[in-house]
Interface confidence: low
C-alpha cells in the first residue's frame, strides 16, 4: 500500500487489522514503555550484527500449549508500506505482533537502512497482554520529517535467540528541490568558453533545472538534473544562478558571478625603502590583479637628468614580495622608477613615476699619472699625481689617501698619509735609506675609499747619492713600474 | 574550414554612406569577434574595430568612431560595417577577420576584402 | 596607442638567402602579443606567427620569431620565390590594436 500524506501526515491506527485476542474495553494498554531521545529499550536484548534482513522473517515455536496444540508462526503483522510525505510534517507508523505469553522479556527495536535508531526520535511499545497472547505495538513517530528521514523502516524482535523482523515501511520525504551542486565563481579569460554545473535532487523527481544570466533565463526548456551549461564566452562580467523546479515548487541557487580576467591595475605607492650608491630598494602595492593571479613585475628605471638619453633599464621579477633591489646604478643619480606587473592577460600601465637619488658611492677610479721622486737635500719623497675623473668619482672628493710602504733587507713598513682635496702634490719623509719606497694612491669622498693607483717604486739609496730623476706610473703596456734612481 | 565571404566592389559618391558585408561559416558565429581592418592602396592595415556577436558588444579605434558603424545578424552569421559621410579618404581594401582572443589578440582568419572606392 | 616601427621598409633577396625583418614597439609589450602576417599582392593578410615565435597551422619551418620587451624579429631561413610578399607585426596588448606599417620582401 502506498500512502501519501500531502497537506498533514495523519498518524496510522495502531491495528492495521482486526487484533486477534480480546483487549481491554477502554483500548488501554496495561504497560507503555516510551522511548523519547536517547531511546534505550528497558528490556534490552543484544541484536545480532546488522545486516540486509530478510523481510518478514517468522520464528517457529517448538513449545505447544496444554492442549498440545502448535502455536501459530510468530511474524509481524502486515501494515502500511509507503508514506509520502511532505518535509516538516509529522508521521507515526508501527508494527505490531502477537507473542504467546510464555516468552519472556520480549523487546522490540527500531532499524533503519540497516541501523539500529538508538536516540533523538519517538519511539513507544504498548504491550497487551491476554489470557494466552500479548499483543506488542511498537510506534515510531517523527515530529517534523527532513529529508534525512528518508529511508526503510522495519522492526527487529529476538524470541529464543530466533530475530523476527517486520517487512519494511518506505518513508519517501517530499520536498521543494535540494541542490547537491551549485554553480562555483569563476575568473575567466573573455570570449572563452567555460562550464557551470548544477544539479538537485527531490523527492519528487524529476527536478528540472532552468538557468538565470543577470536575472534572464538562459534556456528555453528545462534541462534535467544535473545539467552544464556550456557559456561560450563572455564580455563582461556576469551573474549565474539556476532554478531547479519539482512538483513541490522551485527552489533557487546562490547567484555565482563569472568575472572576466583582464589586465591588472597599475601598481600603488611604489616607495624607496634604501638607497645606497649603486642600487634602490623599492616596494610597491599591487593594484588590482584583474581577477587573474600576477606572474610577474617589471621594474622600468630611467636617468632623471635632462641631458641623459632617456634609454630605459628594464629589471624583471616575480610578483611577490612587492619588493625589489635596482642595482647597478650609478651614484649620486636621479632616477624615476615605475613598476608595471602582469598576469596571464597582460601588463598593467605603470605606476606613477617616482623619483629617487642614489647615495655618494666611493671613487670608481684612482688617481691618474702618479710620480714619485726623491728630494735628497731635504730627505723628502715628493709625489704627484691628478685627479681622477669628475664623472667617475661617485661623489665628492674629500681628500686622497696615501700608501708608502718601505722595504729594506728584512724590513717592511706600511704607512699612509691623508691629505686634502685640493692638493695634487704630497711630501713624505724618507723613513729608511737603502730600501724601496712603494707608493699607491687612492681617492677618497664620503662614500669611501676609492681603488688604489698601480704602485710606483723608487729606490732610496744610502746617505751621498744624488739623483733627481723621478719615478712615475708606467705608460701603458710597460710591465715594470720600477725605476731604481 | 574557417570562411569568411565578403560582398562585392562598391562605388559610391562622397557624402553618401555604404555598408559592407561580412558572411561566416565553418564555427560558432557567436563565439569569436568580427574585426574590421582597413587597407588603402599601397598603404598598411588600419584596424578599425570588433563586434562580438553573441551580445553585439563593440570596440572602436577612437579614430573611427562616428565613421564606421558595426552590426551583426546572428541568424544569418553575418557582420556588416556601415560607413558614413564618405570621402575619398575612405576609398580602400576593407577586411573582416576573425579575432582570437587567448589571453592575447590576433586575426586567424580573414576575409578576401571588399574594394572600395568613393568618387563622384 | 603602440606604434610599432618595421625595418627595413623594403628588401630584396635571392633565393637562398637569410632575411631578418625587426619590429619596434614604442612601449613594453608581452612577448605574448606580437603577431606576424604574410600579405601577397591581391591578397588579404595570412597570419604567420603568433605570440612571437609560434607558427600559424601550414607554415613551413623556415619562418621563425622571437624577441621580448619593445623588440621583435621575423626570421627567414633560406628565402623561396613564393616568401615574396609584404609582412606586417602587429600588437594585441592594448586598443587600438596597431599593425606595423609593413617590410616589403622582393626576389632579386
Known amino acids: 500500500a502506498i500512502t501519501e500524506a500531502r497537506e498533514e501526515a495523519k498518524p496510522y491506527p495502531l491495528f492495521p487489522g482486526p487484533f486477534p485476542g480480546s483487549l481491554q474495553t477502554d483500548h488501554t494498554p496495561l504497560l507503555s514503555l516510551p522511548h523519547a531521545s536517547g531511546y534505550q529499550p528497558a528490556l534490552m536484548f543484544s541484536p545480532t550484527q546488522p545486516g540486509r534482513p530478510h523481510t518478514g522473517n517468522v520464528a517457529i515455536p517448538q513449545v505447544t500449549s496444554v492442549e498440545s496444540k502448535p502455536l501459530p508462526p510468530l511474524a509481524f503483522k502486515h501494515t502500511v508500506g509507503h508514506i509520502i510525505l511532505s518535509e516538516h510534517k509529522g508521521v507515526k507508523f508501527n508494527c505490531s505482533i502477537s507473542v504467546p505469553n510464555i516468552y519472556q522479556d520480549t523487546t522490540i527495536s527500531w532499524w533503519k537502512d540497516g541501523k539500529e535508531l538508538l536516540g533523538a526520535h519517538h519511539a513507544i511499545t504498548q504491550f497487551y497482554p491476554d489470557d494466552e497472547v500479548t499483543a506488542i505495538i511498537a510506534s515510531f513517530s517523527i515530529t517534523s520529517v527532513q529529508r534525512s528521514d528518508n529511508g526503510s523502516y522495519i522492526c527487529k524482535m529476538k524470541i529464543n535467540n530466533e530475530e523476527i523482523v517486520s517487512d519494511p515501511i518506505y518513508i519517501e520525504v517530499q520536498g521543494l528541490p535540494h541542490f547537491t551542486k551549485q554553480p562555483e565563481s569563476m575568473n575567466v579569460t573573455r570570449n572563452t568558453a567555460f562550464n557551470l554545473t548544477c544539479q538537485a535532487v527531490g523527492p519528487p523527481e524529476p527536478v528540472n533545472i532552468f538557468w538565470v544570466q543577470n536575472s534572464s533565463r538562459v534556456n528555453e526548456q528545462p534541462e534535467k538534473s544535473p545539467s552544464v551549461l556550456t557559456v561560450p564566452g563572455l564580455t563582461e562580467m556576469a551573474v549565474f544562478s539556476c532554478e531547479a523546479h519539482n512538483d513541490k515548487g522551485l527552489t533557487v541557487s546562490k547567484g555565482v558571478q563569472i568575472n572576466i580576467k583582464a589586465i591588472p591595475s597599475p601598481p600603488t605607492e611604489v616607495s624607496i625603502r634604501n638607497s645606497t650608491a649603486h642600487s634602490i630598494l623599492i616596494s610597491w602595492v599591487p593594484g588590482f590583479d584583474g581577477y587573474s593571479p600576477f606572474r610577474n613585475c617589471s621594474i622600468q628605471v630611467k636617468e632623471a637628468d635632462p641631458l641623459s638619453n632617456g634609454s630605459v633599464m628594464i629589471f624583471n621579477t616575480s610578483a611577490l614580495p612587492h619588493l625589489y633591489q635596482i642595482k647597478q646604478l650609478q651614484a649620486l643619480a636621479n632616477y624615476s622608477i615605475g613598476v608595471s606587473c602582469m598576469n596571464e592577460i597582460g601588463w598593467s600601465a605603470v605606476s606613477p613615476w617616482i623619483l629617487a637619488s642614489t647615495t655618494e658611492g666611493a671613487p670608481s677610479v684612482a688617481p691618474l699619472n702618479v710620480t714619485v721622486f726623491l728630494n735628497e737635500s731635504s730627505d723628502n719623497v715628493d709625489i704627484r699625481w691628478m685627479k681622477p675623473p669628475t664623472k667617475q668619482q661617485d661623489g665628492e672628493l674629500v681628500g686622497y689617501r696615501i700608501s708608502h710602504v718601505w722595504q729594506s733587507a728584512g724590513i717592511s713598513k706600511e704607512l699612509l698619509e691623508e691629505v686634502g682635496q685640493n692638493g695634487s702634490r704630497a711630501r713624505i719623509s724618507v723613513q729608511v735609506h737603502n730600501a724601496t719606497c712603494t707608493v699607491r694612491i687612492a681617492a677618497v669622498t664620503r662614500g669611501g675609499v676609492g681603488p688604489f693607483s698601480d704602485p710606483v717604486k723608487i729606490f732610496i739609496p744610502a746617505h751621498g747619492w744624488v739623483d733627481y730623476a723621478p719615478s712615475s706610473t708606467p705608460a701603458p703596456g710597460n710591465a715594470d713600474p720600477v725605476l731604481i734612481i | 574550414q574557417v570562411q569568411l565571404q565578403q560582398s562585392g566592389p562598391e562605388l559610391v559618391k562622397p557624402g553618401a554612406s555604404v555598408k559592407l558585408s561580412c558572411k561566416a561559416s565553418g564555427y560558432t558565429f557567436t563565439t569569436y569577434d568580427i574585426n574590421w581592418v582597413k587597407q588603402r592602396p599601397g598603404l598598411g592595415l588600419e584596424w578599425i574595430g570588433w563586434i562580438y556577436p553573441r551580445d553585439g558588444y563593440t570596440k572602436y579605434n577612437e579614430k573611427f568612431k562616428g565613421k564606421a558603424t558595426l552590426a551583426v545578424d546572428t541568424s544569418s552569421s553575418t557582420a556588416s560595417m556601415e560607413l558614413h559621410s564618405l570621402t575619398s579618404e575612405d576609398s580602400a581594401v576593407y577586411f573582416c577577420?576573425?579575432?582570437?582572443?587567448?589571453?592575447?589578440?590576433?586575426?586567424?582568419?580573414w576575409g578576401p576584402g571588399t574594394t572600395l572606392t568613393v568618387s563622384s | 596607442e603602440n606604434v610599432l616601427t618595421q625595418s627595413p621598409t623594403t628588401v630584396a633577396a635571392s633565393p637562398g638567402e637569410k632575411i631578418t625583418i625587426t619590429c619596434s614597439a614604442s612601449?613594453?609589450?608581452?612577448?605574448?602579443?606580437l603577431h606576424w602576417y604574410q600579405q601577397k599582392p591581391g591578397f588579404s593578410p595570412k597570419l604567420l606567427i603568433y605570440r612571437t615565435s609560434n607558427l600559424a597551422s601550414g607554415v613551413p619551418a623556415r619562418f621563425s620569431g622571437s624577441g621580448s620587451g619593445t623588440s621583435y624579429s621575423l626570421t627567414i631561413g633560406t628565402m623561396e620565390a613564393e616568401d615574396a610578399a609584404t609582412y606586417y607585426c602587429q600588437q594585441g596588448r592594448s586598443v587600438p590594436l596597431t599593425f606595423g606599417a609593413g617590410t616589403k620582401l622582393e626576389l632579386k
Open positions: 577577420a576573425r579575432g582570437y582572443y587567448d589571453n592575447l589578440y590576433y586575426f586567424d582568419n
Open positions: 612601449s613594453i609589450i608581452s612577448s605574448n602579443y
